[in-house]
């Protein structure tokens, strides 16, 4: 009998207002025993894969995506998915990544904290099963 | 179909060093942690290394037993993994067996090194 | 380092019998645990992963269980294949350690 999956999360480190030119990493978690993590961007047209997973704790594991150097066309609405054999979870829930010309101003702060809804949240849909990972190559366009 | 096929193992004197290749086939390469595992004859299993990917800034990690003798890395480009070992001892004497992270799932057939004077 | 303690060091079965392996972690490891199998050889072959998961072409007579620090693999019908040595593996943090082995020997 096939366990269900919990939806996975997804976070931004160090924050999800980022400067151009900054670096940033998105986090997503899921289950133990995840064989890929994959990182969407706006729609599943756009995605990057990977299979460097580690722990994050006794029963969750995780995996990192960075972008070393943000650029205007890299903010939007990014989410996760995880491949855990036999199926797709769901989606997590958006979380919007912005691109702000760097000011250093007092008061305006390079970045705020990141958080695992994201500021902005949309409904996911279930329909990404019939996919299998992109294990022999990216199917879809890099997302960086 | 995966394939990890180790290369470079042979017969070293103490003190020398070695360089084990693993080229990688069947899977997308670049988007996997890897490790280097060893198994010396007639013992057991021992993890000696393991290097990440590039969205984790290629971190590496070591066995206490081979720390600042033994140094992981990768050719993405190649998709080959590699262990550079200098200082060699005589219980490295193992078979090193490249192996796909994180779950250990694919195995290589082995290389031998042998220490001896 | 967290240490695997695996037991028993060897055992002897007949084909057809049940046969039970142990792996105690010295601290609590979640699901983060693997089972192998290794013929004299050859390269040991992933059976189980995150404690229960059965890996690719493994056949259903091998099962995990356990959580936290105790964990065990089944194999429900000794197969003759199935002679062979067990190692038990902690994926939790480096180094990355495994068990001792268990031998599975012909009676």
């Known amino acids: 009998q096939e366990e269900d999956l919990p939806r996975p999360s997804i976070s931004a480190e160090p924050g999800t207002v980022i400067p151009l030119g900054s670096h940033v990493t998105f986090v997503c978690r899921g289950p133990v025993g995840v064989q890929t993590f994959r990182l969407e961007r706006d729609s599943r047209s756009t995605y990057n894969d990977t299979e460097d997973v580690s722990q994050a704790s006794p029963s969750e594991s995780e995996a990192r995506f960075r972008i070393d150097s943000v650029r205007e066309g890299n903010a939007g609405l990014y989410r996760c998915i995880y491949y855990k054999p036999p199926k797709w979870s769901e989606q997590s829930d958006y979380l919007e990544l912005l691109v702000k010309e760097s000011s250093g101003g007092p008061d305006s702060p390079d970045t705020e904290p990141g958080s695992s809804a994201g500021p902005t949240q949309r409904p996911s849909d279930n329909s990404h099963n019939e996919h299998a990972p992109a294990s022999q190559g990216l199917k879809a366009e890099h997302l960086y | 179909e995966v394939q990890l096929v180790e290369s470079g193992g042979g017969l070293v004197k103490p003190g020398g060093s070695l360089r084990l290749s693993c080229a990688a086939s069947g899977f997308t390469f670049n988007i996997n942690a890897m490790n280097w595992v060893r198994q010396a004859p007639g013992k057991g299993l021992e993890w000696v290394a393991r290097?990440?990917?590039?969205?984790?800034?290629?971190?590496?990690y070591y066995a206490d037993s081979v720390k600042d003798r033994f140094t992981i890395s990768r050719d993405d480009s190649k998709n080959t993994l590699y262990l550079q070992m200098n200082s060699l001892k005589t219980e490295d004497t193992a078979v090193y067996y490249c192996?796909?992270?994180?779950?250990?799932?694919?195995w290589g057939q082995g290389t031998l090194v042998t220490v001896s004077s | 380092d967290i240490q695997m303690t695996q037991s028993p060091s060897s055992l002897s079965a007949s084909v057809g019998d049940r046969v039970t392996i142990t792996c105690l972690a010295s601290q609590t490891i979640g699901t983060w645990l693997a089972w192998y199998q290794q013929k004299p050889g050859k390269a040991p072959k992933l059976l189980i992963y995150a404690a229960t998961s059965l890996a690719d072409g493994v056949p259903s007579r091998f099962s995990g269980s356990g959580s936290g620090t105790d964990f065990t693999l089944t194999i429900s019908s000794l197969q003759p294949e199935d002679f062979a040595t067990y190692y038990c593996q902690q994926l939790y943090s480096t180094p990355y350690t495994f068990g001792g082995g268990t031998k599975v020997e012909i009676k």
């Open positions: 290097i990440r990917t590039k969205n984790n800034n290629f971190a590496t």
């Open positions: 192996v796909r992270g994180p779950y250990f799932d694919y």
